[in-house]
């Protein structure tokens, strides 16, 4: 309705002359008033007092003259629909309507893509009263635009709760072209293929798009933007980087690096972090990832005494958190550890072999055969056993632990003897008579007591008898022997 | 690549601080050294710096410098300079070290990236 | 603390000729084979040669050759190029001791 009322609409004439060019002397505007921090209405003056404008709301009186005539439709008049300018230029447009002395608080405000502008804009609004009507031209200026000044603007008026609104002004900021989308650095596989992607945008339009590789161009003819670029493959790392133009000039990406995926480096740090009888909990710092993920590191370990196997036993875990416990190792042994770690691509190379040892532990065994027998004559219990395998003494023997329980009607009591490492037998006094004597041997180090042997029972009869045999360590699955004399 | 900075004439018992500032690789990925060069006299290890921060001396260098780092640099401070300590200081990358936590020492592998060195003269 | 004994210096020999540098240690060093030698040109930094007794580092041509284990190390260069004068470093590390020993030093003049 609006758009009709203004085609019909014959613009009340503001005065002689060329509008708004030179204007006359005696039209020279009552009031600008800039418009530093927002948009104040723009200001209405009673032409009965020129050239004193009113400060404040400005009542104009209704026209209540029988003799008046309908008044026209308001409308903004015609102005440039379209400008076309460079970036970081300066630009000026305006708007300009003449209302009727009538008409009362009317305001004027500026619209871009449908969203009022609020703000520090340079706006300025000019007041140019006359007898029957008050042109007024709203001027919009800024001052060095930037792409984002790109778009439609327009005023409105309101008036008597009727809103009127110009005709669009169209800005378009033209520059070099502006990138949307920049190619990306990449880790690829050697000799894979791969795509990078190049988006630039005007005004002005069209934007054309050169790769460039290590400095020389890709393709001789351009594309038009968007741009993908499929490289075939890659055998060592390259630079890529995009060329948009435009009727303005060029402008050139940023160069993105794409690195070749390889094996990893190995380790540069291995750290010994604890050492028990069995074993050692080590921590890494990986090399260089070969621009792909580390997935999972392996731990090398292998006995360092010369005249073991050379096996190597090998742990693999997890690369995270760089941080291993080798377990089922032997007690005071020496080991050689490394450490390689993995991505998608393969195995880095092992770190350089390091040294780490396990402390004394317990022994894991028992003495073997332990033999137990009464001997009479000197009222003592003779003990015999071997020694465990040194294999599985887990240190270095400093002797032996034994314990003998003497057991009779009612009455328990267990003694504890130390017995040197040299020996494999040992004599203990008789307890109690008329009683049974369960004895254990455990080897020591200084790692420890070791488990104790299967106990052997003998039993020590009253003065007076005679007959003694020995008592030893059962076989297997037998029920725990005891010989009575 | 590795840089050394911070070399100048100074007083005895002025205290001075050398920088190395790496590029290329970080600090908290490899562990770094100091060694240093009297006027046509050979090289003498100074201390190092773990990946993680630990810090280990030369016996005779000890309490005679101070070897801390950030990201990207590592510093060596010389608490009080004495004419013995003429000498180019060099940073150097540490290939490999192996750490014993548990006994509060450590070994290097090999020293496989240098920098060019910055001379400080000591002199009253 | 452990000290490393470089022999001879200065030692010269002719353009494609041989020159072995020995290198003594006082004790074994780590793992018996983490010793490693330096090459130093004057006015410039010293440079990575051989590590693991006788890994060669990258770069570093095949006429370099390093041998030994323990406590006894040597370098060999064979076919000698005038860009081989310089001055060598032998280096380890020593179990139970951070310390990092350099040798002496071997001055190799090229005729």
């Known amino acids: 309705a609006i758009t009709e009322a203004r085609e019909e609409a014959k613009p009340y004439p503001l005065f002689p002359g060329p509008f708004p060019g030179s204007l006359q002397t005696d039209h020279t505007p009552l009031l600008s008033l800039p418009h530093a921090s927002g948009y104040q209405p723009a200001l209405m003056f009673s032409p009965t007092q020129p050239g004193r404008p009113h400060t404040g709301n400005v009542a104009i009186p209704q026209v209540t003259s029988v003799e008046s005539k309908p008044l026209p439709p308001l409308a903004f008049k015609h102005t440039v629909g379209h400008i076309i300018l460079s970036e970081h230029k300066g630009v000026k447009f305006n708007c300009s309507i003449s209302v009727p002395n009538i008409y009362q608080d009317t305001t004027i405000s500026w619209w871009k893509d449908g969203k009022e502008l609020l703000g520090a804009h340079h706006a300025i609004t000019q007041f140019y009263p006359d007898d029957e009507v008050t042109a007024i031209i709203a001027s919009f200026s800024i001052t060095s635009v930037q792409r984002s000044d790109n778009g439609s603007y327009i005023c409105k008026m309101k008036i008597n709760n009727e809103e009127i609104v110009s005709d669009p002004i169209y800005i378009e900021v033209q520059g070099l072209p502006h990138f949307t989308k920049q190619p990306e650095s990449m880790n690829v596989t050697r000799n894979t293929a791969f795509n990078l992607t190049c988006q630039a945008v005007g005004p002005p339009e069209p934007v054309n798009i050169f790769w460039v590789q290590n400095s020389s161009r890709v393709n001789e003819q351009p594309e038009k933007s968007p741009s993908v670029l499929t490289v075939p493959g890659l055998t060592e790392m390259a630079v890529f980087s995009c060329e948009a133009h435009n009727d303005k000039g060029l402008t050139v990406s940023k160069g993105v690096q794409i690195n070749i995926k390889a094996i990893p480096s190995p380790p540069t740090e291995v750290s010994i972090r604890n050492s028990t009888a069995h074993s050692i909990l080590i921590s890494w710092v990986p090399g260089f990832d070969g621009y792909s993920p580390f997935r999972n590191c392996s731990i090398q370990v292998k006995e360092a005494d010369p005249l073991s196997n050379g096996s190597v036993m090998i742990f693999n875990t997890s690369a995270l958190p760089h941080l291993y416990q080798i377990k089922q190792l032997q007690a005071l042994a020496n080991y050689s550890i490394g450490v390689s770690c993995m991505n998608e691509i393969g195995w880095s190379a092992v770190s350089p072999w390091i040294l780490a040892s396990t402390t004394e532990g317990a022994p894991s065994v028992a003495p073997l055969n332990v033999t137990v027998f009464l001997n009479e004559s000197s009222d003592n219990v003779d003990i015999r056993w071997m020694k465990p395998p040194t294999k599985q003494q887990d240190g270095e023997l400093v002797g032996y632990r034994i314990s003998h329980v003497w057991q009779s009607a009612g009455i328990s009591k267990e003694l504890l003897e130390e017995v040197g490492q040299n020996g494999s037998r040992a004599r203990i006094s008789v307890q109690v008579h008329n009683a049974t004597c369960t004895v254990r041997i455990a080897a020591v180090t200084r790692g420890g007591v070791g488990p104790f042997s299967d106990p052997v029972k003998i039993f020590i009869p009253a003065h007076g008898w005679v007959d003694y045999a020995p008592s030893s360590t059962p076989a297997p699955g037998n029920a725990d022997p005891v010989l009575i004399i | 690549s590795v840089e050394e900075s911070g070399g100048r004439l100074v007083t005895p018992g002025t205290p001075l601080t050398l920088t190395c500032t790496v590029s290329g690789f970080s600090l908290s990925s490899n562990a770094m050294s100091w060694v240093r060069q009297a006027p046509g006299k050979g090289l003498e290890w100074i201390g190092i710096?773990?990946?993680?921060?630990s810090t280990y001396s030369a016996s005779w260098a000890k309490g005679r410098f101070t070897i801390s780092k950030t990201s990207t640099t590592m510093d060596l401070k010389i608490t009080s300079p004495t004419t013995e300590d003429t000498a180019t200081y060099f940073c150097?990358?540490?290939?490999?070290?192996?750490?014993?936590?548990?006994?509060?020492?450590?070994?290097?592998?090999?020293?496989?990236?240098w920098g060019q060195g910055t001379l400080v003269t000591v002199s009253s | 603390a452990a000290v490393l004994t470089q022999t001879p210096s200065p030692v010269s020999a002719a353009v494609g000729g041989t020159v072995s540098i020995s290198c003594q240690s006082s004790?074994?060093?780590?793992?018996?084979?983490?010793l490693s030698w330096y090459q130093q040109k004057p006015g410039q930094p010293p440079k990575l040669l051989i590590y693991?007794?006788?890994d060669l580092a990258s770069g570093v041509p095949s006429r370099f050759e390093g041998s030994g284990s323990g406590t006894e190390f040597t370098l060999t260069i064979s076919d000698l190029e005038c860009d081989d004068a310089a001055t060598y470093y032998c280096?380890?590390?020593?179990?139970?001791?951070?310390?990092?020993?350099f040798g002496g030093g071997t001055e190799v003049v090229v005729k």
């Open positions: 280096a380890g590390g020593y179990s139970g001791d951070s310390d990092y020993a």
């Open positions: 150097a990358r540490v290939g490999f070290f192996v750490g014993y936590g548990a006994y509060d020492y450590g070994i290097i592998h090999r020293l496989d990236l």
């Open positions: 004790k074994s060093i780590y793992n018996n084979n983490w």
């Open positions: 710096i773990s990946s993680s921060g």
């Open positions: 693991d007794a006788s």
